[in-house]
């Protein structure tokens, strides 16, 4: 049946309504709207924001509209102490300083609380020593440098370049390194695209262009203070000292003018290879400290930020569902920025606000979607995802027994080449059907549909003539709904073309540049990739509250599930002597893995042959097809990763913004031939895998036929 | 119109102190990096002082380290130049200039001058 026939209601307030209803022109004016001044997370102006944004999806339409606050660590700059970096010389005398605020941008020269550049949860502190380059700062940038340069990290204060992984994965590989300070600086061979202009002339990061962001290692936790549980009024919070994630040495971020006069000084080893050296004209020597001339003068740090507990705002709206209220499809993104937020995340949240008022006209006509939708507009995602973690906490019993799916709503751009999509494998078929039935919005597609645009230009690697999806990571707010509570979960935007534009996320990603201007110039000006965003998020909210049978396809999952034994076992593999030795088999995974194809294809026939007009039946096959995903969860979680749950996705323990497959595993092997204790190390492979083949095929079990 | 307007100027005995000023127009002061450049009768022009736009750094010539002091009020989009011990080698026709780098670190080119102010140095 469709979807309208099952909501008793006229066939006019279909899927096709819902879309024809998304307008360009109002995703333009809500982003204007939301980036006139900033709303950090904890400010009156983000308060004041989201009574706004309650006020207006009310007058969509919405059932209820609803604030939830909680009390959560957040990490502010002095606003009478600022933070800097110096070169100092011997007498101590400082002979430069790194800049105190970035250049404001044209026409807000006078907008006052634009929060300066600053790395947030860094503790105070004033180190000072030699530097010590380290590229990006990932896991294989130490290993070069201890194993293979023999260069000691020990009480030097490093300075790392961002891109290619979570800042917050560079700290902690710093502080396990012994660096007593970090520096993170923008290289132009990172966030300079050539031939593009910098701002207000064009996209590029200019030299006083600055990244924030919060440097944790929070692995899911959410709160510092209130690990698996809300901050609200009655929690019990740890002690600063015994917060989750926080980092233990200071930390400051710098644009390419500044770090251009800490590296051109750099004496020491010579950087490795071409893959260390950036686009400044500097050296790029690893150190550590200074070159001849300069051998005396050190580097120092002066961080005077504070961390305290503050309030925050979700706002969370509700649209009543009409046949299964008691199931959840949600729709959700955060509302604060680090300042204006031109693309993070106010582009995400106008996409959603446009979709909320889709919604409601179709409300307004009478219309209801068969499953509950709930729309959510979190805060302080930017300082560790707090809003919808907390929620989630608040709400996870709840969450656990109804949740059917999250999508994710944040930047709906990061370029403007193609659609990129990350999601469970329950909803490829869903996204692949959706696209079908959209319009292209690229140039040279006219008439042609999204799914032809996206899968010539972003192609999989192994099917050819589909599209490529990837697996979900973390950096988020879906992060809680699906590595710790098992929700099926999805995101999408458009993208740049990530085979000639090398550089990582952005080159204007949380500095004071993200403006309304840059988008409205340089990246969406008739908006129409936004609208394509709107209408690929909210189609997939439209079919997954909307159709009689779950669009979920558990045949999928059997195909990862595959291909992620062979390649973990690929790995396992280049240890043929040490498998042998200590009995390591995989022979038991692969098996579930089998079992689970057999089955999920057995179910696929029964969901396609079953009665759909016998609601009890009906219910039943859905719920099957809600719970698969909360199959696969742990209860115990990963080691020393309790709230990453999920046994066949986490975020990479190396880099928070990738996935992982087969996690458990996968870190068990990494790097086991550095293991003091190598029969232990492969004990515990052994274990990971007996984990994930019991997971697979209790996960398979749960679509057997129930009696 | 892009323009810079000095003041200030005038005639001052040996010791004495002077503040110029310089009024910004045009463009917001608070994204550039300012000079102060001075026109000695006869000889060549001489760089004397550099501010970053956030006032983090300051560079000084050698003749007038100690002695001179470069400031800037953002929200007023002005620049100073604080004179104090002045010498009969001081007097000259002082500009303000913009350097040509938003943002820049370090002192570079100048984009745009103003018309100079006069200070004379006599007892």
């Known amino acids: 049946k469709s979807s309208s026939e099952a909501t008793n209601i006229t066939p006019k307030h279909n899927m096709k309504a819902f879309l024809d209803e998304l307008k360009a022109e109002n995703i333009k004016k809500f982003l204007h709207n939301f980036t006139q001044i900033p709303h950090l997370a904890g400010t009156e102006q983000n308060f004041q924001l989201a009574k706004q944004i309650q006020s207006q999806w009310k007058e969509f339409g919405l059932d209820s509209v609803e604030l939830t606050h909680y009390d959560v660590l957040l990490s502010y700059p002095n606003k009478t102490h600022p933070n800097y970096i110096s070169i100092i010389n011997e007498d101590g005398n400082e002979i430069f300083n790194t800049s105190l605020f970035e250049p404001p941008p044209a026409g807000y020269e006078n907008v006052s609380d634009i929060v300066p550049p600053f790395s947030a949860f860094s503790p105070q502190g004033m180190p000072e020593g030699d530097l010590v380059y380290v590229n990006y700062a990932r896991t294989e940038d130490f290993f070069k440098l201890e194993r293979d340069m023999k260069i000691n990290c020990s009480g030097k204060i490093v300075i790392a370049r961002y891109g290619k992984v979570f800042r917050g994965n560079k700290v902690k590989n710093a502080q396990l390194a012994g660096a007593t300070g970090v520096i993170l600086y923008s290289d132009p061979a990172d966030y300079f695209a050539p031939g593009v202009k910098s701002y207000p002339d064009g996209w590029n990061l200019p030299g006083g262009g600055v990244q924030r962001g919060n440097i944790l290692n929070l692995n899911g936790a959410g709160d510092p203070l209130t690990p698996g549980y809300p901050a609200n009024e009655y929690a019990y919070r740890r002690g600063i000292a015994e917060a989750v994630g926080l980092p233990s040495i200071p930390v400051h971020p710098i644009g390419y003018y500044d770090a251009q006069k800490l590296l051109e000084k750099m004496g020491g080893s010579a950087s490795p290879d071409s893959s260390w050296r950036g686009s400044l004209k500097v050296p790029y020597n690893v150190g550590p400290g200074f070159t001849g001339n300069f051998s005396t003068q050190k580097v120092k740090m002066h961080i005077h930020s504070t961390s305290e507990v503050t309030r925050i705002y979700n706002v969370i709206g509700t649209l009543r569902g009409a046949v299964e209220p008691d199931r959840y499809v949600i729709l959700g993104g955060h509302r604060d920025s680090w300042v204006f937020g031109g693309i993070d995340p106010q582009s995400g949240a106008a996409v959603v606000h446009e979709i909320v008022r889709s919604f409601g006209t179709l409300k307004k006509e009478g219309w209801r979607p068969r499953r509950t939708i709930l729309f959510a507009s979190w805060d302080a995602e930017e300082f560790g995802l707090l809003g919808s973690t907390e929620w989630a906490e608040e709400n996870s019993r709840l969450l656990q027994e109804r949740g059917v799916a999250y999508i994710n709503a944040d930047s709906s751009i990061e370029g403007n080449y193609t659609l990129r999509v990350d999601c469970t494998p329950l909803m490829y078929s869903l996204v692949y059907n959706l696209t079908k039935e959209l319009e292209s919005p690229d140039e040279g597609f006219e008439g042609k549909s999204l799914y032809e645009s996206w899968t010539k230009k972003s192609p999989s690697p192994e099917f050819s003539g589909m599209p490529r999806i990837s697996k979900l990571g973390s950096g988020n707010d879906f992060e809680v709904f699906f590595q710790r509570l098992g929700i099926a979960s999805g995101r999408a935007r458009y993208t740049k073309n990530w085979e000639t534009n090398k550089f990582s996320s952005y080159p204007l990603y949380h500095s004071v540049y993200e403006t309304y201007e840059l988008v409205e110039k340089f990246y969406d000006p008739m908006f129409k990739y936004h609208l394509t965003v709107a209408q690929v998020r909210g189609g997939m909210v439209f079919e997954l509250a909307n159709s009689v049978v779950l669009p979920f396809d558990c045949r999928d999952y059997a195909v990862v599930l595959r291909k992620y034994a062979d390649k973990i076992y690929n790995i396992s593999m280049k240890h043929p002597q040490e498998m042998k030795t200590y009995s390591v088999s995989f022979d038991s995974l692969f098996s579930a893995v089998k079992n689970f194809t057999e089955i999920a294809s057995k179910f696929s026939e029964r969901l396609r042959d079953f009665d759909k007009s016998n609601p009890i039946l009906l219910r039943m096959m859905n719920d099957q097809l809600m719970f698969l995903e909360r199959a696969f969860i742990d209860p115990l979680g990963l080691p020393d990763r309790p709230f990453y749950r999920h046994v066949i996705y986490a975020p990479s323990s190396h880099n928070k913004y990738a996935g992982e497959s087969f996690p458990g595993i996968y870190d068990a092997l990494f790097d086991i031939e550095s293991k003091v204790d190598p029969s232990q190390a492969w004990g515990e492979v052994k274990r990971q895998i007996s984990i994930a083949t019991f997971t697979v095929q209790a996960a398979a079990e749960t679509l057997s036929e129930v009696a | 119109e892009v323009q810079l307007v000095e003041s200030g100027g005038g005639v001052v005995q040996p010791g004495r102190s002077l503040r110029l000023s310089c009024a910004a127009s045009g463009f917001p002061l608070i994204s550039y990096g300012m000079h102060w450049v001075r026109q000695a009768p006869g000889k060549g022009l001489e760089w004397v002082a550099f501010?970053?736009?956030?006032?983090?750094?300051?560079y000084y010539a050698d003749s007038v380290k100690g002695r001179f002091t470069i400031s800037r009020d953002n929200s007023k989009n002005t620049l100073y130049l604080q004179m104090n011990s002045l010498r009969d080698e001081d007097t000259a026709l002082y500009y303000c200039?913009?350097?040509?780098?938003?943002?820049?670190?370090?002192?570079?080119?100048?984009?745009?001058w103003g018309q100079g102010t006069m200070v004379t140095v006599s007892s």
């Open positions: 200039a913009r350097d040509r780098i938003v943002g820049g670190r370090v002192p570079d080119a100048f984009d745009i």
């Open positions: 501010m970053t736009y956030d006032g983090s750094n300051r």
